[in-house]
Interface confidence: medium
């Protein structure tokens, strides 16, 4: 049986950080799992990955281009990304793999989450020129 994942369809980011939650139709207190976050329509870039285990919190590591951390509970993995820039605006996909014990399981591809990072504009109040 494939595992289903629910993601928010859109996250608009004003600051430079975001938390993306991946909710799975499976209990994460499995024995060994690998939770990852991918960027792009074709999931070309592995942004962040955490190897989890029933007995210890997963260690999350990020792609050189990103800063990430994460956390999980029974059915949700939350990825936290920071130092984001406008060019990080893209669609992001959650993935979970249960590595052991057999059988290997992973999730059905979700619709993803579009993370839209807003450009920061420094607003200067313009005084109207005197005539």
């Amino acid at each position: 049986n494939k595992i289903l994942v629910k993601q928010s369809p859109l996250l608009v980011v004003d600051s430079n950080e975001v938390s993306l939650s991946c909710r799975y139709s499976y209990n994460l207190l499995a024995k060994e799992f690998r939770a990852s976050l991918y960027k792009g329509v074709n999931s070309d870039v592995e942004v962040c990955v955490g190897n989890g285990n029933f007995t210890y919190q997963p260690q999350f590591r990020s792609n050189a281009e990103f800063n990430c951390d994460g956390d999980f509970d029974n059915e949700t993995v939350t990825f936290r990304l920071w130092n984001l820039h406008v060019n990080h605006t893209d669609i992001y996909f959650c993935k979970i793999e249960f590595m052991y014990p057999p059988p290997y399981l992973d999730n059905e591809r979700s619709n993803g989450t579009i993370i839209h990072i807003k450009e920061k504009h420094l607003c200067h109040t313009q005084s109207s020129p005197k005539l």
Partner: antibody, heavy 118, light 113 residues
Amino acid sequence: QVQLQQSGAELARPGASVKLSCKASGYTFTSYWMQWIKKRPGQGLEWIGAIYPGDGDTRYTQKFKGKATLTADKSSTTAYMQLSSLASEDSAVYFCARNYRYSSFGYWGQGTLVTVSA
Amino acid sequence: DIVMTQSPSSLTVTAGEKVTLSCKSSQSLLNSGNQKNYLTWYQQKPGQPPQLLIYWASTRESGVPDRFTGSGSGTDFTLTISSVQAEDLAVYYCQSDYSYPLTFGAGTKLELK
């Protein structure tokens, strides 16, 4: 480095029970499955079952349900297998092994010889 | 349960010879999720525990000589030893890691002429 040290040879009477041990070191004992395997002379390898020391979860092959009981002691990082109602066909070498990467049997103990004889 | 069938049961070889061992499973060991075949090969020498040679049907374990090659997919698998050495004389087992219960083939015994 990962080491699995098994207890010494056992000589037992038919109908008796034996408890074999497998002392683990060099890794986090609670985070990996411990497997048990039977090897009779001139025959192949048989998987008996596995235990996850983190929570005591066990899996057995049908043939060994009721014959083998797997337990684990976290404090001593030791896995145990008790074999009950011993018969001559239980005479074999028994191995413990730990899963590794994508293989169930990556690290092995040296084996314990069990001889059942009247 | 998945049944693993190995052939031949024994093989007499000459040093330097190329050897091919066969393993067939009663159902596919290919996992569609990650496109990996959950088939593992082990080598067991007399008086020793088995040693992991190849996992995922074709991935050689570190430290295993490159004369050992695993291939195949689905239900048919092969272990090839390109040039047999005296130290390769052992029993070779294939094993399904696809699902519980885990099952082994009966083994192929490699003997020297």
